[in-house]
Interface confidence: low
């Protein structure tokens, strides 16, 4: 029996203009951090991103991060070839720990992980991993985006050059080049077992300033399966002091994460202090608004064939410029509703813009997970006016993902619609 129905977007496709909406930050009135002279800052309120520049001048620079990356206008840089990773395939030692800093959850790496290539000036050592996430239900939480599309989580790995500095902090304080990788996490119907040690660790650092040692994990398994397709640009730290010293490597291909695993991020708390009252708040939407590119150029890797076999269905340009090989913007207003105990109705609206009319039909694609098996079905709706479809024989124990694509002449397609997750037989999500 379908007792409760919960339906939500699996991927928020908000453009940059939506970045200031739905921010659930608390009122922050702390003047300075107690233990140090670092200026206090927050992700919203009186000490939010628009005020960072008052205490950290670099936050007002012209080469700030994060940014939106428009793939179509990124130039291929022949110097950006395969990344060389060293130590990434080893299991982490039991000295690796995770901390809830109140602004993010950080993994402090205690093993030797090195990266070179990709135009980095030397062999860089990984220092730490940090995460940025949204509010709930797979909402946008990434700092960077590709073609305006943001992801539920962004993982950032920070590197420094150990030949030049004895520590990461020294490199920062001396305003010298560091490296950073950005990895997007995308909602998938199944748990990603590679993330289990991280998810388990999150449950041990729910409260601000909590620390825990992590079960062994393989850092390479937290990266996309294919590392060949990445973007490169010069930017900054995305938190104060916003130093413009970061060589960013942004991977195009996302890493899967299940909705259940995402919940561990949404369960993290932080503490805020107003005058003499301390309050406990959820740590959510811990991302900086995107910054203008100004006069910078984004490059993309020149690794042979790496861009051909990518997850382009996730990342095709949703902006649909005239040069896109798409016939329309995506179908919009996706909805999933139960018709009865075993059937669902998927509905949508016509794309806002059709570049190569007419739309001949719509393709509905849905996948589900049951007993660890992932299955997928696709069918076509011939009419371009009756914008709904019925899915029968729905299993109450399965998680479903739905998306719709418009099909035009010459088999040209639109971008895929927002993916909708549907979970039946759920009392609370």
């Amino acid at each position: 029996v379908l007792h409760y129905v919960v339906c939500f977007p699996a991927l928020t496709e908000g453009y940059v203009g939506a970045l200031h909406e739905n921010r659930h930050g608390s009122a922050v009135q702390i003047r300075r951090r107690k233990a140090s002279g670092d200026p206090y800052w927050a992700y919203s309120g009186a000490y939010g991103p628009e005020h960072w520049v008052t205490s950290s001048v670099s936050c007002g620079g012209r080469h700030q991060s994060p940014i939106d990356i428009l793939d179509q206008y990124a130039r291929v840089g022949e110097e950006y070839q395969e990344l060389q990773l060293d130590g990434f395939d080893n299991e982490s030692s039991n000295k690796t720990w995770m901390k809830n800093t109140g602004k993010t959850v950080a993994i402090l790496l205690k093993d030797d992980y090195f990266v070179s290539g990709a135009g980095l000036p030397g062999r860089f050592k990984a220092e730490k991993v940090e995460f940025h996430w949204g509010h709930s239900n797979g909402s946008a939480g990434s700092e960077h985006s590709i073609n305006g599309r943001r992801f539920p989580v962004e993982m950032q790995i920070f590197f420094y050059n150990p030949d030049d500095f004895d520590s990461f902090q020294t490199a920062i304080s001396e305003n010298r080049i560091i490296g950073a990788m950005a990895i997007f996490f995308q909602v998938s119907p199944r748990d990603n077992s590679a993330l289990d040690p991280i998810i388990h660790g999150l449950k041990g650092v729910v409260h601000h300033e909590k620390e825990t040692f992590l079960d062994p994990f393989v850092l390479r398994d937290l990266l996309p399966a294919s590392l060949g397709s990445y973007y490169r640009y010069t930017g900054s730290l995305t938190t104060p002091p916003c130093s413009e010293i970061v060589e960013w490597i942004v991977f195009r291909r996302p890493v899967p994460i299940s909705y259940h695993q995402l919940e561990a991020f949404y369960s993290i708390f932080t503490t805020e202090q107003q005058d003499h009252v301390k309050s406990v708040e959820y740590l959510r939407n811990n991302f900086r608004p995107q910054q203008r590119l100004h006069d910078r150029v984004v490059s993309k890797s020149a690794v042979r064939d790496s861009w051909n076999h990518d997850m382009t269905d996730f990342l095709e340009n949703p902006l649909g410029t005239e040069a896109s090989k798409v016939c329309s913007s995506p179908p919009i207003h996706m909805k999933v509703q139960p018709l009865n105990q075993t059937a669902l109705q998927v509905s949508w609206s016509q794309p806002e813009t059709i570049y190569h009319p007419p739309i001949m039909n719509y393709m509905i694609s849905y996948s589900w997970t049951k007993n660890e098996d992932e299955k997928e079905k696709t069918f076509t709706k011939d009419s371009d006016k009756d914008l709904k479809a019925t899915i029968s024989h729905v299993s109450p124990d399965s998680l479903y993902l739905f998306r719709v694509q418009a099909v035009c002449r010459n088999d040209m397609r639109s971008d895929f619609s927002q993916t909708m997750l549907f979970q039946a037989n759920t009392t609370r999500i």
Epitope: V16, A18, L70, R292, D295, E322
Partner: antibody, heavy 120, light 111 residues
Amino acid sequence: AQSLEESGGRLVTPGTPLTLTCTASGFSLYSYDMSWVRQAPGKGLEWIGLIDGGGNTYYASWAKGRFTISKTSSTTVDLKMTSLTTEDTATYFCARELWPAYSSGAFNIWGPGTLVTISS
Amino acid sequence: SFVLTQPASVQVNLGQTVSLTCTADTLSRRYASWYQQKPGQAPVLLIYRDTRRPSGVPDRFSGSSSGNTATLTISGAQAGDEADYYCVTTDGSGSSYLVVFGGGTQLTVTG
């Protein structure tokens, strides 16, 4: 061919609100910065503000509060003007940035302009 | 506020080379664009990012930048080059942004 065209310019009395529309042909506005620029008779060009691909708006300091730029579809951008005075009499142009990948004030597509006259 | 300064008017003899300048504090850290505008017409982009010419612009028009001065050079001036020329740059930082126009230079071609 890619082009822009402004519409909505007319003679109005001071204080009357007015909305101008810029319509794009041959490309989608979702990737580009779209600026509004004006030119008073016999004077130079003056930037009013822009809306970027994501819908964020940026204004000249003198235009904040009185001028509002909005994207009404993938092919139209509006400029809403309030509290107009005779000083706002000008030809109003919309213009598109050359590339969306960076912004440097390089507008390669301009509309022919629409004349707004404020007079009592 | 950020101001771009251009000479109000410049004269050049037919067939000669003329340089139009544009100065501002910190222009060395900005890119300049140049536009040509003839009476009753919309401006036309001649140069962007200091030196780059869009397709369709004759190579008689070239741009350069040194220190806090951007320069538009027109070689072999023609009668049809008589127009107003504007330099443009951007100001702002982080997520703030402004486009700044110079006051314009009226070019007269004599002879």
